[in-house]
């Protein structure tokens, strides 16, 4: 089959007449009376149809045209290209062979962008018109006038620092300090020993070199220097005016400090939140804290607070902390963390909830309190829910037990332990899951509505009645269900039993919405219209 | 019976609450509601549910974040659909779970939503 | 999850047998918490089978539902006209790790 075959990459620059030349195989002749080849461009909003000449069965050319794409925020498109034979045969393309349109200026407005650019492309900066251009655009002829990266010696007047980041850092040094800018060389060795951030030189790190664009460098120390801020300045090669940089922002040195961490206690295991807090805490590009010489997981931090997750402690105690900033070690042996033994739990009162859960279980054990956001948690036919639990003191907590309600799975009238059941105490894996207790989950009350329509007439002063079942779990001792019956928002006094529940309605008249609670449960069962005396004895 | 309503024609983009209503009874605090859909000339696919005696709902993984079931009255349960495609042209149909068999006992006759331009 | 059904459509002769199958890419919940439905055109679905193989009331004992875990069969014995429809499975599942719920594609009978 006839196809075309790779040859050497296809670069047009937009705007310039040339033909474009490209290896094939099995071309065929075209015979009298049948139309020759063509070159199609798919260039999105101007496709390009051009005659194509064959000159053997293995070389073509397209012949001399101009090529355009809109718009100046694209730099170098890849254009698909087929060849067509006698205006409809499409010759193969099975490595799917693309011209590569470009325009210099696009995307490259300063020196440093345009020398950077594929080489390929033949871009180089037009000095006198300060624009990148092809050699032929550039219109003074000096050859100085017309700068391409093939010099070696080709360097980009007036580099510029944009920003700095970090814009502070300990004395000691150690700091990675990003400079983004333009023109900041075009090699590495072009930059290599020119950054100094006041009289303090900044080592730039190759790897992270982004020609002309970004330097990385680490400061070094500045401990001897008095002077508390300072420019950067970046010189490329020579630090003569046209070849100097200095920041608009000046670098700080500062002394990071910190006095205080909250909370300053948590369990042995770990797994604790703390905020440590003090001043310059921002400072530098890295930061590491360790508690009791283990590392605190790094969360966040601002210049007043550094926040981690404490590790596992080797035993109860005050255990040091050390902020490293960089080359800076800060420790305060007034600040202390503390690791108490890890809570216990020991028992739960009462040992059963409903399906929706919300109902109040007080739990006793000991540790309590050294976590500060306890959860109670319970997994029941796959789902898992949390709630969170108040604490008292170090022996006492008051939480709700969890919702367990999903369709696939409800508790028996006689109760169902949950699969898991257990307290979310930061790093404590033994109360994850209590296989000491018996706790037991029973399904919701069922109540019935108050009519097929939902609305239910009432006499004044006399008593609603709500029927239903489930409204006492068979639980073992004295504590039951605590329902509140509410009439519109006023609530009634209650008399539960196994199969209703009687409410003494207040002394309200009109319409009111009922509704029923029992922890997380919340259900209402209509709407109550009750007539006033005076309408009942009009004759 | 159960009874839809709310389907109407919309624009891509749109927002539409959809309404389910229990004629002749009212919820019993055990119930889950459920709302299913149809294509036209495909099959059913589950949406969410809610749970009468409480706020639990849960949702298809599809549907989480633009779908919104909820308990309004204790005879209708609505289903509020946001940011909705041509995608979402369906029969919709609200049905009643029954927790002693796990499974949809009772169902309404659908109400028809139509997204196009 | 998935529910996969046999594909559509099948064809029947009046008094004939029906089976069509569905399989669970896991198991249902309790191994049998899977249903099945007849729909036919312009009407919502009708529940004819819970919990695997439990008929629901006022529905012909010519349906028959069997199966456990994933694999599941409604076989309809001694096929009338009436039972031309669409029919579907559902199956439940552990709310917490992924859906709680899943139908099948369908699957469409014709019945001869």
């Known amino acids: 089959c006839p196809q075309i075959l790779p040859s050497t990459q296809i670069y047009v620059p937009v705007g310039v007449v040339k033909p474009i030349t490209l290896a094939a195989r099995n071309l065929p002749q075209p015979q009298s009376g049948q139309r020759g080849y063509e070159c199609l461009f798919h260039i999105p909003g101007s496709p390009a149809r051009v005659t194509a000449l064959r000159f053997n069965s293995s070389s073509l050319q397209c012949q001399n045209s101009s090529y355009s794409y809109e718009g100046n925020d694209v730099s170098d498109l890849p254009v698909n290209l087929s060849v067509v034979w006698n205006g409809n045969f499409v010759i193969d393309n099975p490595q799917n062979i693309q011209a590569h349109l470009y325009k210099c200026p696009a995307l490259r407005e300063s020196c440093g962008l345009c020398l950077k650019a594929d080489p390929r492309f033949e871009c180089g900066w037009c000095v006198a018109e300060r624009r990148c251009s092809l050699r032929h655009h550039c219109a003074a002829d000096t050859p100085a006038s017309w700068m391409h990266a093939r010099h070696g010696s080709s360097r980009c007047t007036d580099p510029k620092i944009l920003k700095l980041s970090p814009e502070t850092g300990p004395r000691q040094g150690g700091t990675r300090l990003t400079i983004t800018g333009e023109n900041l060389g075009l090699r590495f060795e072009d930059v290599r020993l020119g950054v100094r951030v006041g009289k303090v030189l900044c080592s730039p790190v190759e790897s992270e070199y982004i020609s002309a664009e970004q330097i990385v460098c680490e400061i070094g120390d500045a401990s001897s220097v008095r002077a508390h801020d300072a420019l950067v300045e970046v010189c490329v090669r020579d630090c003569s005016p046209h070849y100097r940089a200095l920041s608009p922002k000046r670098f700080t040195f500062v002394t990071p400090t910190f006095y205080r961490v909250s909370p300053s206690r948590g369990p042995l295991s770990g797994g604790t939140w703390i905020g440590i807090e003090g001043s310059h805490l921002n400072a530098g590009s890295d930061v590491a804290v360790s508690v009791g010489g283990r590392p605190c997981s790094f969360s966040w931090r601002n210049s007043r607070e550094i926040r981690c997750l404490t590790p596992p402690g080797q035993s109860p105690g005050s255990a040091p902390i050390i902020i490293n900033i960089n080359r800076a070690q800060l420790t305060n042996p007034e600040v202390k963390y503390n690791y108490t033994e890890d809570p216990t739990i020991l028992r739960i009162d009462p040992e059963w909830s409903i399906n929706s859960g919300g109902t109040l279980l007080t739990v006793t054990g000991t540790n309590l309190a050294t976590v500060r956001e306890p959860r109670i948690r319970a997994k029941y036919g796959g789902i898992e829910r949390e709630n969170g639990c108040l604490v008292y003191n170090d022996t006492t907590m008051v939480c709700r037990a969890p919702s367990v309600a999903n369709p696939v799975r409800s508790p028996p009238e006689l109760g169902e332990r949950p699969d898991e059941l257990g307290f979310v105490m930061d790093n404590v894996r033994s109360l994850l899951v209590l296989n000491s207790t018996s706790f037991l989950y029973y399904p919701d009350p069922v109540l019935e509505p108050l009519s097929p329509t939902g609305l239910l007439e009432l006499k004044p002063s006399s008593p609603l009645i709500l029927k239903g079942r489930n409204l006492l779990p068979p639980a073992p001792g004295n504590s039951r269900l605590n329902y509140t019956v509410l009439i519109g928002s006023t609530p009634c006094t209650l008399t539960v039993s196994e199969t209703q529940l009687l409410c003494e309605a207040p002394n309200l008249t009109g319409q009111h919405k009922v509704t029923v609670r029992a922890g997380g449960f919340e259900f209402s069962p209509g709407t109550l219209q009750v007539y006033s005396d005076s309408l009942l004895t009009l004759p | 019976s159960l009874e839809e309503s709310g389907g109407d024609l919309v624009k891509p983009g749109a927002s539409l609450t959809l309404t389910c209503t229990a004629s002749?009874?009212?919820?019993?605090?055990?119930?889950?509601i459920y709302w299913v859909r149809q294509a036209p000339g495909k099959g059913l696919e589950w949406i969410a549910c809610?749970?009468?005696?409480?706020?639990?709902a849960y949702y298809a993984s599809w549907a989480k974040g633009r779908f919104t079931i909820s308990k309004t009255s204790s005879t209708t349960v609505t289903l509020q659909m946001t940011s909705l495609t041509a995608a979402d042209t369906a029969t919709y149909f609200c049905?009643?779970?029954?927790?002693?068999?796990?499974?949809?006992?009772?169902w309404g006759p659908g109400t028809l939503v139509t997204v196009s331009s | 999850q998935m529910l996969t059904q046999t594909a559509s459509p099948v064809s029947a002769a009046v008094g004939g047998t029906v089976t069509i199958k569905c399989q669970s890419s896991?198991?249902?919940?309790?191994?049998?918490?899977l249903s099945w439905y007849q729909q036919k055109p312009g009407q919502p679905p009708k529940l004819l089978i819970y919990?695997?193989?439990t008929l629901a009331s006022g529905v012909s004992s010519r349906f028959k539902g069997s199966g456990s875990g994933t694999q599941f069969t409604l076989t309809i014995s001694d096929v009338q006209c009436d039972d031309a429809a669409t029919y579907y499975c559902?199956?439940?599942?552990?709310?917490?790790?992924?859906?709680?719920?899943?139908f099948g594609g369908g699957t469409e009978v014709v019945v001869k």
């Open positions: 049905a009643r779970w029954d927790n002693s068999g796990r499974a949809l006992k009772l």
């Open positions: 002749g009874f009212s919820f019993s605090s055990n119930y889950w």
């Open positions: 809610i749970y009468i005696g409480s706020d639990s």
């Open positions: 896991q198991s249902v919940a309790d191994n049998n918490h």
């Open positions: 919990f695997a193989s």
């Open positions: 559902l199956g439940n599942y552990d709310c917490g790790s992924a859906d709680c719920h899943a």
